[in-house]
């Protein structure tokens, strides 16, 4: 006869990253007995909600239980209903929702509101919805990605082939990209953190850990694009906007109204003698790096060095892994490859954005063309950031690794606040039985 | 500190390693470089030796030196000197550990004398 | 690839004048610049470091600026003990390049 399957013990976990751009929603699994072990949850599901980032619904909050609906429909679909009670449910909500806070606070709260209503009525086991901070975000995407790529454990992991060669324990940094901020999170080599805002702590499985972090708000790659842009219009002769980090022969009309609308922008405000303007490409990728060199102030520095506009880093160390927009753009211009090196990068960005917009339409027609057009200023932001903003240098570039995944899970913040949030990394290597939740961090 | 030792009048040809000794600093954490200066001429990079072992040489000096290191010590091998060689040779500390943008700490330097 | 020219090669300056140094890459360095002054007979010693960045212990006389493949040292109320010969260095690149050192610029102050 034939032996029956035991019932899987697994649990599981949802988080939803509310983004200024999407909200994507996590499914993540693990073995119950396990819990305490490094390397054993992994992702299972990403779902994209269809429609904007929640702070677009501040005049529309009604409509944000139908935008949540078919992702939390599917997370019902792939959790056994049996696990369906016991699945804790976590919404962190990033810059774009920092932004409207900084607008409204009671804005902000409004749509948290709306958001938490909407996911208290699924069986699910909700438990809130919250701004995380910039420093959050960069913590746990450092602890996401070193948790997949198995640097908190000796032992051996789930996964048999782990990437990017690191049989060493020496930790990953952490560069993340958004649409509305970016974060630079590592443990640099012997040095003293001189701002303490950007000092974080940990023990994990054993071992202490200090590490630096800093989120730049207004530097996600759609809100660096309108500071470019609010920058530029300022010296325009009349309402034609010649663009370099847009292709030959694009061509797009902005309100001004929108322009001015974000927080990010407020430093370059003034009164124009129009309502609109035109973008029009001229697909120049030396001019366009020059323009966005202008965002970053690097004429002031507090510190022994700094990125820009006076915040302090210490020197680099180590290998870097650069995700979320880092990885998606440069995996679209096809740059995500460990043999290409930076001159080769910038070469070819040169040679991208001057194609004429027509030829880049024909060549991408799968892809929406808003997104499309924007690739040539993310591509340019990107190396400008890197080199820049965080002093990666030709030699140094070589450490940079754009991930997407690792062994199938979404580098990203996510996982790292979910483990943080049930419990799941100790402060203390676990013995063969799990450690009491008192020495969690 | 860093101090630089081995400089001595040679004959072309003769092969010659300088040492660069270094107190309080963790070459582990830290990349070192070597630079050159004739007499009455200007700073002549050479190469560095990066935390991790790598090394990286300047294009003219790309088989004529070779950069190793202990844990105290950073070594130069000229490994055919030539009268154009006579040189002071410095040692120097970088301001990082691979991003090497700046050398903050600079050996006396050690004259090496090449001649027939 | 990435060489630095400097100029002038060398200027003479009144004590409490301005001196101006200029420093040229052949391609983008972004910040990636250091400036370091050499007395007669000794070592070289870091001023500025990241194009802008003052290193300890030096006086805020001197000054540097500029990014990408221009860059300037400016030594205001210059004083005798500022007679030196003053190099720029890149950073950006230490592999296969030819030298990362600028020719160099002598300060005689008069």
């Known amino acids: 006869t034939q032996n029956k399957a035991l019932p899987e013990n697994v649990k599981y976990g949802i988080v939803l990253d509310a983004g200024s751009s999407h909200t994507s929603l996590y499914i993540y699994k693990w073995p119950a007995e396990k819990e305490n072990d490094t390397g054993v949850v992994h992702q299972v599901e990403e779902c994209r909600v269809k429609g904007p980032g929640i702070s677009k619904f501040v005049q529309k909050v009604n409509e944000i239980g139908i935008y949540l609906t078919d992702c939390m429909e599917r997370a019902r679909e792939v959790i056994p209903r049996s696990q369906h009670q016991e699945t804790p449910v976590y919404l962190g909500a990033t810059a774009g929702m920092r932004l409207l806070r900084m607008e409204s606070e009671e804005l902000a709260d409004r749509v948290l509101d709306v958001v938490e209503r909407s996911l208290s009525n699924y069986p699910f086991d909700f438990q809130g919805a919250r701004i995380i901070t910039g420093q959050e975000e960069g913590a746990y995407g450092w602890i996401t990605i070193n948790y997949l790529l198995g640097k908190f454990s000796q032992k051996t992991r789930w996964f048999s082939i782990v990437p990017y060669e690191t049989n060493n324990q020496e930790t990953f940094g952490a560069l993340d990209l958004g649409g509305a901020s970016t974060q630079v999170t590592f443990v640099p080599q012997n040095q003293t953190i001189e701002s303490p805002d950007n000092a974080l702590q940990f023990r994990l499985y054993g071992k202490d850990y200090n590490v630096y972090t800093h989120s730049f708000l207004c530097y996600g790659k759609d809100q660096a694009l309108w500071q470019k842009l609010a920058k530029d219009i300022q010296v325009a002769s009349n309402e034609i906007l010649r663009d370099p980090c847009f292709h030959p022969g694009y061509k797009k009309v902005v309100n001004v109204s929108d322009l001015y609308k974000t927080p990010c922008t407020k430093r370059f405000e003034m009164t124009l003698p129009f309502q609109q303007f035109e973008i029009q490409g001229i697909g120049n990728y030396q001019q366009c790096h020059q323009s966005i060199l202008e965002l970053f102030n690097t004429s002031y520095c507090p510190y022994s060095q700094c990125a820009f506009n006076g915040i302090f880093l210490p020197p680099l160390q180590g290998d870097f892994g650069a995700f979320s927009a880092f990885y998606f753009v440069m995996k679209f211009l096809n740059l995500t490859s460990e043999k290409v090196s930076q001159e080769k990068v910038t070469e070819m960005m040169k040679k991208f954005c001057a194609q004429p917009w027509e030829e880049i339409k024909t060549s991408y027609a799968g892809v929406k063309e808003k997104y499309l057009s924007e690739y040539c200023f993310s591509g340019t932001y990107i190396l400008s950031l890197l080199l820049q903003g965080y002093h990666f240098t030709a030699d140094s570039w070589e450490h940079i690794h754009f991930i997407g995944k690792i062994q199938g899970s979404d580098a990203g913040w996510t996982l790292g606040y979910m483990l943080n949030l049930t419990n799941m990394i100790p402060a203390e290597q676990p013995l063969s039985t799990p450690l009491s939740h008192s020495t969690y961090v | 500190s860093v101090e630089e030792s081995g400089g001595r009048l040679v004959t072309p040809g003769t092969p010659l390693t300088l040492t660069c000794t270094v107190s309080?600093?963790?070459?582990?954490?830290?990349?070192m470089s070597w630079v050159r200066q004739a007499p009455g001429k200007g700073l002549e990079y050479i190469g560095i030796i990066r935390n991790n072992d790598i090394t990286y040489y300047a294009s003219w000096a790309k088989g004529r030196f070779t950069i190793s290191k202990t844990s105290t010590t950073v070594d130069l091998i000229i490994t055919s000197p030539t009268t154009e060689d006579t040189a002071t040779y410095f040692c120097?500390?970088?301001?990082?550990?691979?991003?090497?943008?700046?050398?903050?700490?600079w050996g006396p330097g050690t004259l090496v004398t090449v001649s027939s | 690839a990435y060489d630095m020219t400097q100029t002038p090669a060398s200027v003479e300056v009144a004590v409490g004048g301005t001196v101006t140094i200029n420093c040229q890459a052949s391609e983008r360095i972004y910040s990636n610049l250091a400036w370091y002054q050499q007395k007669p007979g000794q070592r070289p010693k870091l001023l500025i470091y990241?194009?802008?960045t003052l290193a300890s212990g030096v006086s805020s006389r001197f000054k540097g600026s500029g990014s990408g493949t221009q860059f300037t040292l400016t030594i205001s109320g210059v004083q005798c003990a500022d007679a030196a010969t003053y190099y720029c260095q890149q950073g950006y690149s230490n592999n296969n390049v030819d030298n990362t050192f600028g020719g160099g610029t002598e300060v005689v102050v008069r």
């Open positions: 309080g600093i963790d070459l582990s954490s830290n990349a």
């Open positions: 120097a500390r970088g301001g990082g550990s691979y991003s090497i943008v700046f050398w903050n700490l």
């Open positions: 990241y194009a802008s």
